[in-house]
């Protein structure tokens, strides 16, 4: 029985050109995390394998950095990065847990209504 829950950073609105950290945390289970996949829509961004460490997809190597922890840092954001990101935790013996984060990337000139944007 899968008892775990995934907590995420929550949805994020950020400015074009900035960087953000996507993080998920698996709790309420003693299952062993064997691998974490980070995906956007149907694209694989990165894998963190318990034994083999990090692998960043070649098409994202310039703008994606591993960590902190099992999280992922996206840099030099573009409006095209807007979309849903998935952290997929492969665990034993529970199976797969998935967290979801929606990232909205805005042109810096459209900071309307006094929005507080994330540029760490």
């Amino acid at each position: 029985m899968m008892t775990g829950t995934i907590e995420t950073t929550g949805n994020i609105s950020a400015e074009k050109g900035g960087s953000i950290i996507l993080q998920c945390h698996l709790s309420s289970t003693t299952a062993q995390v064997t691998q974490v996949n980070w995906e956007q829509q149907d694209q694989l961004l990165a894998i963190c394998n318990a034994d083999l460490g990090w692998h960043i997809s070649p098409s994202f190597k310039d703008r994606v950095a591993p960590g902190p922890g099992l999280g992922l840092t996206l840099q030099s954001l573009t409006v095209n990065d807007t979309g849903e990101y998935f952290c997929i935790y492969h665990t034993y013996p529970d199976g797969t847990y998935t967290g979801r984060i929606f990232l909205e990337v805005l042109e810096s000139s459209v900071a309307e209504h006094g929005a507080r944007f994330q540029i760490p």
Epitope: G10, I12, S13, Q41, V79, G83, E84, E104
Partner: antibody, heavy 119, light 112 residues
Framework: EVQLQQSGPELVKPGASMKISCKAS????????MNWVKQSHGKNLEWLGL????????SYNQKFTGKATITVDKSSNTTYMELLSLTSEDSAVYYC????????????WGQGTSVTVSS | DVVMTQTPLSLPVSFGDQVSISCRSS???????????LSWYLYKPGQSPHLLIY???NRFSGVPDRFSGSGSGTDFTLKISTIKPEDLGMYYC?????????FGGGTKLEIK
């Protein structure tokens, strides 16, 4: 002036599928998410999902995965939501609503499309 | 999914009253950068819902200043001072911090 014009009411048979449209005007269409909301029994509101026209990125409420499909036609500034394999549970008013940039809220709403599923 | 619980379900008022509507979330609505995506809407039969408050406490354009929002974390409040006839209807809170976005069950503001 921001306007969202939805297609008219629909009466459809159980098991059928249908597509609702939402034509946007008065703003830069590709720069804002378009969301879809279901209102059942004139009361409960449920977020079905969204699309970002700039890159056609979508996000769905998993409760409606396989039930709703959201698409966009940038040439006509129109967003569509297709509802599949309709049952009486899908009878409701469906709204499109523009996302408020930077705040994950819904700032402008269409007039709603009433869908009745009945044999 | 995040559960949004609104209280009360029904709120009988007299014109001129001041009222508060509560919205509680099953988990914190602050994201990792400290932003909280909580908004309030008014729905009147025959109309579409419309935005009143976004980002906890920001009034949307055209919304009278008798509407105010407050709160943090999991506990949020919409206050309406000096109730007017056009304020009657269903009020909903919406969280947009976590996927999927979820609405509260609504609070019906009606005349006593």
């Amino acid at each position: 002036e921001v306007q969202l014009q939805q297609s008219g009411p629909e009466l459809v048979k159980p098991g059928a599928s249908m597509k609702i449209s939402c034509k946007a005007s008065g703003y830069s269409f590709t720069g804002y998410t378009m969301n879809w909301v279901k209102q059942s029994h004139g009361k409960n509101l449920e977020w079905l999902g969204l699309i970002f026209p700039y890159n056609s990125a979508t996000s769905y409420n998993q409760k409606f995965t396989g039930k709703a499909t959201i698409t966009v036609d940038k040439s006509s500034n129109t967003t569509y939501m297709e509802l599949l394999s309709l049952t009486s549970e899908d009878s409701a008013v469906y709204y499109c609503a523009r996302g408020l940039r930077g705040f994950f809220a819904l700032d402008y709403w269409g007039q709603g499309t009433s869908v009745t599923v009945s044999s | 999914d995040v559960v949004m619980t609104q209280t009360p379900l029904s709120l009988p008022v007299s014109f001129g009253d001041q009222v508060s509507i509560s919205c509680r979330s099953s988990q914190s609505l602050a994201n990792s950068y400290g932003n909280t995506y909580l908004s309030w809407y008014l729905y009147k039969p025959g109309q579409s819902p419309h935005l009143l408050i976004y980002g906890i406490s920001n009034r949307f354009s055209g919304v009278p200043d008798r509407f105010s929002g407050s709160g943090s974390g999991t506990d949020f409040t919409l206050k309406i001072s000096t109730i007017k006839p056009e304020d009657l209807g269903m009020y909903y809170c919406l969280q947009g911090t976590h996927q999927p976005w979820t609405f509260g069950g609504g609070t019906k503001l009606e005349i006593k």
